[in-house]
Amino acid sequence: CDLPQTHSLSNRRTLMIMAQMGRISPFSCLKDRHDFGFPQEEFDGNQFQKAQAISVLHEMIQQTFNLFSTKDSSATWDETLLDKFYTELYQQLNDLEACMMQEVGVEDTPLMNVDSILTVRKYFQRITLYLTEKKYSPCAWEVVRAEIMRSFSLSANLQERLRRKE
């Protein structure tokens, strides 16, 4: 399965929506900056089978959706932009799920790189804990928005490779 061109477009739209979501100047939140340890090695894609890469991308997008669909998130971000954001994320999840089915068939569960899935989950755990420690402050959300934008940009490289890979 090759990811459709629309998937790359959706990823770009997601980045644009996240950029529009910014409400406060990042400069006013410099003191809240945090290194969440984005697991770059999981998105390099060299050591991956295609099915594993798709699983890792799916986990990242699903966790992003969950992160931004909490009550605390709804109270922070513009509702119209959030709805657009959800739509794009769902589009990407659907693309990846369609690919998964084609890669291995509906009934078959391939050997996933479970440690990669766990590594992505832990990355989002660090983000979640940061938000709870900061009591979901506007600056904390701004830092997280910037981090997720960065992670989507970095994962876009893997998505692009998947789109071209036979």
Partner: antibody, heavy 119, light 108 residues
Framework: QVQLVQSGAEVKKPGASVKVSCKAS????????MHWVRQAPGQGLEWMGE????????IYAQKFQGRVTMTRDTSTSTVYMELSSLRSEDTAVYYC????????????WGQGTLVTVSS | EIVLTQSPATLSLSPGERATLSCSAG???????LYWYQQKPGQAPRLLIY???NLASGIPARFSGSGSGTDFTLTISSLEPEDFAVYYC?????????FGQGTKLEIK
């Protein structure tokens, strides 16, 4: 509010299979991994594995690999855990628990399903 | 597999006393992935503490957690009658996820 409702108690003979269901409500079913944890009478908790209802992929504990099958039905927001080749040591209460992150990790549990394996 | 060993197996105390429950990991566990659960007879476990020291929603402030590496502690500052139950530590730092064997807190 989040609710996980499990199927009723089962009595099975050694060598048979059992299929326990867990129906979820109060949240977007496909967004969270669902886990299965069991507890033998008077014993501690034991993690069996998890399923992502969105795409159906599973991760099983090595101990249960080959004997456990976790599936889901997105149309009814239900996950299933089937355990085959039952033996007396499989007599336990089986729980489903919803994944999540931070304060949401295993914050929601089903009420439990007692599976008794006896000849 | 990370083995979690809880001690003591049973702790007999009176209401108003302080309870200290230990959880020792066979190998290092990142504190972000160490959780505590309470279970009463006939009930499902209930989340008490997440990420070593954070109180779950609705849990009274008399409960607290601490620790790092391989040694973790759950403390109940002043026992209430409803606190007598079994307590489990749990890790999801690596597969397979594991639980301690439990500490039964009983009324003296």
């Amino acid at each position: 509010q989040v609710q996980l409702v499990q199927s009723g108690a089962e009595v099975k003979k050694p060598g048979a299979s059992v299929k326990v269901s867990c129906k979820a409500s109060g949240y977007t079913f496909t967004n969270y991994w669902m886990h299965w944890v069991r507890q033998a009478p008077g014993q501690g908790l034991e993690w069996m594995g998890e399923i992502n209802p969105s795409h159906g992929r599973t991760i099983y504990a090595q101990k249960f690999q080959g004997r456990v099958t976790m599936t889901r039905d997105t149309s009814t927001s239900t996950v299933y855990m089937e355990l085959s080749s039952l033996r007396s040591e499989d007599t336990a209460v089986y729980y489903c628990a919803r994944g999540g992150l931070g304060p949401a990790w295993f914050a929601y549990w089903g009420q439990g399903t007692l599976v008794t394996v006896s000849s | 597999e990370i083995v979690l060993t809880q001690s003591p197996a049973t702790l007999s105390l009176s209401p108003g006393e302080r309870a200290t429950l230990s959880c020792s990991a066979g190998s290092s566990v990142d504190s972000s992935y160490l959780y505590w659960y309470q279970q009463k007879p006939g009930q499902a476990p209930r989340l008490l503490i997440y990420s070593t020291s954070n109180l779950a929603s609705g849990i009274p402030a008399r409960f607290s957690g601490s620790g790092s590496g391989t040694d973790f502690t759950l403390t109940i500052s002043s026992l209430e009658p409803e606190d007598f139950a079994v307590y489990y530590c749990h890790q999801w730092s690596s597969y397979p996820f594991t639980f301690g064997q439990g500490t039964k807190l009983e009324i003296k």
